[in-house]
Amino acid sequence: MMTGTIETTGNISAEKGGSIILQCHLSSTTAQVTQVNWEQQDQLLAICNADLGWHISPSFKDRVAPGPGLGLTLQSLTVNDTGEYFCIYHTYPDGTYTGRIFLEVLESSVAEHGARFQIP
C-alpha cells in the first residue's frame, strides 16, 4: 500500500533569462527512494539514481544543473520553458510517486509586475 505523499513547489513564475529551482519532497513513507526522474511533458531532463548519481540529458546539459538535493535547477530560462514539469520518485517497495510543477516564464514587461526572478 502506498502511503507516501509528494509536496511540490506548485506554481512558479520566473523571468526570461533567469533561473529557477524545481523541488519535490516525498513524505509519510518509509520506502527507499531508488531513483528520481525529472521530466517535462514526455522529455526526460535528468535522473538522480541512488547508486549512480546524476545524469543530465545531453540536450539540456547546458541549462540544467543537479540539486539542491533531489531538486533541479533550470538556468537561462526562455519563454519556451513554460510548461508542466514532473518529478517521478521510484521507491521500494511502494512503487512510483509523481509530483507536478507548473512553470511560467515571463517576458520582462510582465515580470516587472513582480519580483525579479521568482514571481509567485
Partner: antibody
C-alpha cells in the same frame, strides 16, 4: 497530489456577508499566487480576486465588480485562502472556485463552493 | 479591460469531424498569455491548452491551438464523444484577467 477544498458557501440575503475558505495541500502554498474565480449558474467564468505571496508583499488584485466589497486573504501557516464577501448582491450568486496560478495561467482548480444570494 | 469574444457560442459535431472554435480579443494579447480551459458538465474547469498552443498533460493530441494578436483558435482534428464540454479562452494583458464567454461543444 494537489488538493484545493473550498468551504463556506450557502444561502445569504442581499446586503449580507459570507466568508469562504480554501484548504490547500500537496504544494508549497506560501510561494504560490492564489485566486478566486466564480461562475454564475449557466454562465461563464469570471476572475474575482488574486493574492500573491509574501515575497510579493501579499499584493491583492480585484475585479471591478467586487472591489470594495470583497477581501481576499491567506494564512500561509495553515495553507488557507479566504474570501470575505460583504454587501452581497443577487448577481454574486455563483460557484466560487479556489485556484492556484502562475502569473497568467490558472493551473490548479478546486471543486467549488456554491454561494446563493436571495431574499 | 480586454474583452474576449468566443464563437460560436454553441456548436454541434459528429464523431470524426474536425471542429474549430475561435476567441477574439478587443485588444492585442501576447500569444504567451492566451490559454484555454475545458469544463465538462458539473465539473471544475481544467487547464487544457496554454501559451496558445501547448497541450496540458493528459490532453489528447487531436487538440491544437493557434493564433496571434487578437485572433486565436482551438481545433479538434477528429472529435470524439468525450470532447463534449464547454471551452473557455483566457488572457492576461494586465489586470483584470479575463475569460471568454465559452463555446459549448455538443456531440451528435
Amino acid at each position: 497530489e494537489v488538493q484545493l477544498v473550498e468551504t463556506g458557501g450557502g444561502l445569504v440575503q442581499p446586503k449580507g456577508s459570507l466568508n469562504l475558505s480554501c484548504a490547500a495541500s500537496g504544494f508549497t502554498f506560501n510561494t504560490n499566487a492564489m485566486n478566486w474565480v466564480r461562475q454564475a449558474p449557466g454562465k461563464g467564468l469570471e476572475w474575482v480576486a488574486r493574492i500573491r505571496s509574501k515575497s510579493n508583499n501579499y499584493a491583492t488584485y480585484y475585479a471591478d465588480s467586487v472591489k470594495d466589497r470583497f477581501t481576499i486573504s491567506r494564512d500561509d501557516s495553515q495553507s488557507m485562502l479566504y474570501l470575505q464577501m460583504n454587501n452581497l448582491k443577487t448577481e454574486d450568486t455563483a460557484m466560487y472556485y479556489c485556484v492556484g496560478s502562475t502569473m497568467t495561467i490558472f493551473s490548479y482548480w478546486g471543486q467549488g463552493t456554491l454561494v446563493t444570494v436571495s431574499a | 479591460e480586454n474583452v474576449l469574444t468566443q464563437s460560436p457560442a454553441i456548436m454541434s459535431a459528429s464523431p470524426g469531424e474536425k471542429v474549430t472554435m475561435t476567441c477574439r480579443a478587443s485588444s492585442s494579447v501576447s500569444s504567451s498569455y492566451l490559454h484555454w480551459y475545458q469544463q465538462k458538465s458539473g465539473a471544475s474547469p481544467k487547464l487544457w491548452i496554454y501559451t496558445t498552443s501547448k497541450l496540458a498533460s493528459g490532453v489528447p493530441a487531436r487538440f491544437s491551438g493557434s493564433g496571434s494578436g487578437t485572433s486565436y483558435s482551438l481545433t479538434i482534428s477528429s472529435v470524439e464523444a468525450e470532447d463534449a464540454a464547454t471551452y473557455y479562452c483566457q488572457q492576461y494583458s494586465g489586470y483584470p484577467l479575463t475569460f471568454g464567454g465559452g463555446t459549448k461543444l455538443e456531440i451528435k
